[in-house]
């Protein structure tokens, strides 16, 4: 399913192919080659068309080299050099730079805020349902059910910290054992990786950008899925996480610590709390089978309340029903007893938009979901645009070299581990792996960070989010301290185990290969990205959930054949690529299967037909709407007026030839011009900081 390779700087031409390249897979990025490219900003790039095989002269002049779509784009500078500017120009350029930085920080701020509101929106739409998932009694005996509940709940509330805190409170109140909680934590780890995958979808407009962004986001997904695939059976068989964490918890005499520092929330909360405020306790109460909570709204109305513990007198049928024999009396007509009650007096209302609307949670959630996705998308587009204009020439070279270059030999292997620490540290600062990985996604998309470097940063992010949980656990009250700490440690060691599995040996870095494969497919068939999201985060977990409810027999009856077929396909695929001669002629390729079972082309035709109606209405819509449309319908021609996702038409006609990415043009500005996004005159006024 990998795209056809093409010449380094060739103009896309669907009629001319590179001989003998058909079977080649994209090669790994060559760092030295990339450095040369970026350093040589002055050198003109020769544009050649693929000539017939008899024309050898050009081939000698310009050696044919396969262009890897995963190579980082050269973000060249189109502006006037700093040294060539007059004082006025330099001042103007300086203020332009400052302005861009302020804009970038502003959009980044609203990007993070919209992620927070997106989480709130998801909780309003699906929070109560998520809480009800937890109240299923089968979780105790079925780890697979626990896993999918963890995935579904985290996807529904868009926050692994919310789902883990529900688990903690359930363990604290003995509704759940630590053993039963571990698969839920694993599921929560998977569920939290949906956020940056959604963010990656926003970069659908540009195929090559989308390829990188989507792969960069899904590397997190694949790491989590693969870790669970290996570690869940290991945990079920050995209970190693439970045992290790229990030993740690019992060997230390922990005292209650302080709350984990809210570093990023301090900045974002003043804004997000003006939009909506939620009463997170409601979801926990539903999870703990509190009937009253089912009718409560998640939207917080009263922010200042006075809680008074008092004794109230209540009537009882007879004095035998008294709560305490000494606190019992009659007034001659009714029998009374004293009952301790907590009386909550509402003092001040919250200050947010929805406080006086009294709308149902679903309505508020839907409004916020749409708005936050629009803001998220808008901010992302602007961040990518600003970064695209800032990260050019020497700036790009410096940044890319700093981020993507390894330490000198023999310490090159340490670079990745440093990246893991950086990822953990950054996540600890922003207090959310979703925020960190979501911020990373556009940077991967525009080519500032390679997937190979993004991978350890993401793994570090997974560790960072667990250290936050450990701190939060240490700050929890006495009764919840042990359970919350043990669960936080389980989460921590699960991620450590995952890193040990899928990082130290380069050969085992399967998530990178899988993410790149998915990136290639999604770049070619963009609807597949949405399909992947629905399948992996909703349909598979919901199917397993449904089968688990039907009982072990049904789950095994359906699951075993499915697993058997998957293993069979994987083994066959391995043999086809490594030693096809072992296999009979018929099994050496997939041609024996009908086309719809081995290719996405027929499916693409179905999707295109199905979304045909959107293509017509897509024209002249706003940029954000157009992006969403392009994601569904792969339409390059329909969005002419807003030009937000128009690709080169030749590429669409010759399906197997990959779409030319902006990196094949002299610079990013020209590539944008070609796609009608930037007026031609803009390129002359661009300035570079260095």
């Amino acid at each position: 399913m990998a795209p056809w390779p093409e010449l380094g700087d060739a103009q896309p031409n669907p009629d001319k192919y590179l001989e003998g390249a058909a079977g080649q897979q994209p090669t790994a990025p060559d760092k030295s080659k990339e450095t040369n490219k970026t350093d040589n900003t002055e050198a003109p790039v020769t544009k050649i068309e693929l000539l017939p095989s008899y024309s050898t002269a050009t081939l000698i002049d310009e050696p044919t080299e396969v262009d890897d779509p995963w190579n980082l784009p050269t973000l060249q500078d189109s502006g006037i050099k700093w040294s060539e500017r007059d004082t006025k120009g330099k001042i103007l350029c300086f203020f332009q730079g400052i302005g861009r930085l302020i804009l970038l920080l502003g959009f980044l701020y609203f990007f993070v805020c919209s992620l927070d509101i997106l989480s709130s929106a998801f909780q309003l739409v699906g929070g109560k349902m998520a809480g009800q998932f937890f109240s299923n009694s089968s979780i105790m005996s079925n780890p697979l059910l626990g896993l999918v509940i963890g995935v579904l709940v985290t996807v529904l509330v868009q926050s692994s910290s919310t789902s883990t805190s529900i688990v903690v409170s359930m363990v604290s109140s003995s509704l759940l054992t630590v053993r039963a909680a571990i698969p839920i934590i694993m599921g929560a780890n998977i569920g939290t990786s949906i956020t940056n995958t959604i963010v990656a979808l926003m970069q659908v407009g540009d195929r090559s950008e989308f390829r990188r962004a989507f792969a960069g986001a899904t590397v997190h997904d694949f790491f989590n899925w693969l870790s669970v695939l290996v570690l869940l059976p290991v945990e079920v068989a050995t209970h190693y996480l439970e045992i290790i964490t229990q030993l740690i918890v019992e060997s230390f005499h922990f005292k209650n610590g302080e709350d984990a520092p809210d570093l990023l929330k301090v900045i974002t909360k003043p804004f997000t709390k003006l939009i909506v405020q939620l009463d997170k306790k409601v979801i926990s109460q539903i999870a703990m089978n509190d009937e009253k909570a089912k009718n409560k709204s998640l939207v917080k109305i009263w922010c200042k309340t006075f809680t008074n513990k008092t004794q109230i007198n209540v009537t009882v049928p007879s004095t035998a029903n008294c709560t305490s024999p000494s606190l019992c009396w009659t007034d001659g007509i009714q029998n009374w007893t004293m009952k301790n009650v907590t009386y909550k007096e509402n003092i001040a209302k919250c200050q947010h938009i929805f406080v006086n609307f009294h709308l149902p949670d679903l309505a508020v959630g839907t409004i916020l979901l749409i708005l936050s996705l629009l803001v998220l998308c808008g901010c992302l587009i602007m961040i990518v645009k600003i970064l695209g204009s800032v990260l050019k020439g020497q700036v790009a070279t410096v940044i890319k070299k700093t981020i993507n270059t390894d330490f000198p030999f023999p310490f090159a292997w340490l670079t990745g581990y440093l990246a893991i620490l950086v990822g953990a540290g950054m996540t600890f600062i922003v207090q959310s792996s979703s925020v960190f990985t979501s911020a990373l996604t556009p940077l991967i998309g525009i080519g500032v960070i390679t997937i190979e470097r993004a991978y350890p940063l993401t793994l570090g992010s997974n560790i960072g989010t667990t250290t936050t949980a450990i701190l939060a656990a240490l700050a929890s009250p006495g009764n919840a301290l042990r359970s919350s700490l043990q669960i936080a440690l389980c989460h921590f060691f699960f991620n450590i185990s995952g890193i040990l599995l899928w990082y130290p040996i380069p050969f085992t870095r399967l998530p990178i290969r899988m993410a790149k494969g998915l990136g290639n497919i999604s770049a070619k068939y963009r609807w597949f990205a949405v399909f992947y999201l629905i399948i992996f985060f909703f349909l598979i977990p919901l199917t397993v959930f449904g089968l688990s409810l039907a009982g072990w027999r049904v789950l095994v009856g359906v699951g075993v054949p499915v697993v058997f077929i998957i293993i069979l396909v994987l083994c066959l695929r391995l043999l086809q690529s490594r030693c096809p001669r072992v296999l009979p002629k018929k099994l050496q390729n997939w041609n024996f299967l009908p086309l719809w079972m081995r290719s996405l082309k027929p499916w693409d035709a179905v999707v295109s037909k199905f979304t045909g109606c959107f293509q017509m209405r897509c024209c002249c819509c706003c940029r954000v709407c157009c992006r969403a449309c392009c994601l569904l319908c792969d339409c390059p021609k329909c969005c002419r007026c807003s030009k937000c996702c128009e690709d080169l038409e030749e590429a669409q006609e010759g399906q197997d030839v990959p779409v030319k990415a902006p990196e094949t043009f002299d610079n990013i500005t020209i590539s944008r011009e070609a796609q009608g996004e930037v007026p031609a005159s803009d390129s002359k006024t661009e300035c570079t900081a260095l």
Partner: antibody, heavy 120, light 107 residues
Framework: QVQLVQSGAEVVKPGSSVKVSCKTS????????IHWVRQSPGQGLEWIGG????????NYKQNFRGRATLTADKSTSTAYMELSSLRSEDTAVYYC?????????????WGQGTTVTVSS | DIQMTQSPSSLSTSVGDRVTITCTAS??????VAWYQQKPGKSPKLLIY???TRHTGVPERFSGSGSGTDFTLTISSLQPEDVATYFC?????????FGGGTKVEIK
């Protein structure tokens, strides 16, 4: 101030009935229970029954059931006790007393008493 | 019905003396006991409720104690105005019942 003012003394014939009133003031009538207690000459106190004016729920001591009827008029904040089939042993001073509903403070205010003499 | 037995039925003592009146319930009544004072020719007046809580305006010399079945009303220093009959009452279960009364006189 809190006041429970009872009707004047009554002399009645055996077998007849008597209705004693208790007009209250100085407190929320519906927030209290009005009890009726009698004291026979040279004897102790005996509880007859009580009424919750708010909902007209009543309760009587077993030996007064069917003979005593307690009523309350919220509009005038007045409670009434009617005792029928009077016998000579019903000669006593009848008191009304208030008791704060849902509270354990007992009978904190009493009326001045109404003397009922059953005599042929 | 719960019987409340008061003792003594009468007592005569001097001004300034400590007076103790006891009341015994026929079964456990917790602390649901009240004490009333009735001066000659007057209606009863609440002194103590919930076994030991003084009602508003009652002088500090009056105190109540006890729980279960045995209860005590104590006048720490008898005053001339304390001459009256004292009744105990249980309100643990219906019907409400009173003790026979204790008549307090000054020698």
């Amino acid at each position: 101030q809190v006041q429970l003012v009872q009707s004047g003394a009554e002399v009645v014939k055996p077998g007849s009935s008597v209705k004693v009133s208790c007009k209250t003031s100085g407190f929320f009538f519906t927030e209290y229970i009005i009890h009726w207690v009698r004291q026979s000459p040279g004897q102790g106190l005996e509880w007859i029954g009580g009424i919750i004016p708010n909902n007209d729920v009543t309760n009587y001591k077993q030996n007064f059931r069917g003979r005593a009827t307690l009523t309350a008029d919220k509009s005038t904040s007045t409670a009434y006790m009617e005792l029928s089939s009077l016998r000579s042993e019903d000669t006593a001073v009848y008191y009304c007393a208030r008791w704060r509903n849902a509270y354990y403070s007992a009978m904190d205010s009493w009326g001045q008493g109404t003397t009922v003499t059953v005599s042929s | 019905d719960i019987q409340m037995t008061q003792s003594p039925s009468s007592l005569s003592t001097s001004v300034g003396d400590r007076v103790t009146i006891t009341c015994t319930a026929s079964q456990d009544v917790g602390t649901a006991v009240a004490w009333y004072q009735q001066k000659p020719g007057k209606s009863p007046k609440l002194l103590i409720y919930w076994a030991s809580t003084r009602h508003t305006g009652v002088p500090e010399r009056f105190s109540g104690s006890g729980s279960g079945t045995d209860f005590t009303l104590t006048i720490s220093s008898l005053q001339p105005e304390d001459v009256a009959t004292y009744f105990c009452q249980q309100y643990r279960t219906s019907p409400l019942t009173f003790g026979g009364g204790t008549k307090v006189e000054i020698k």
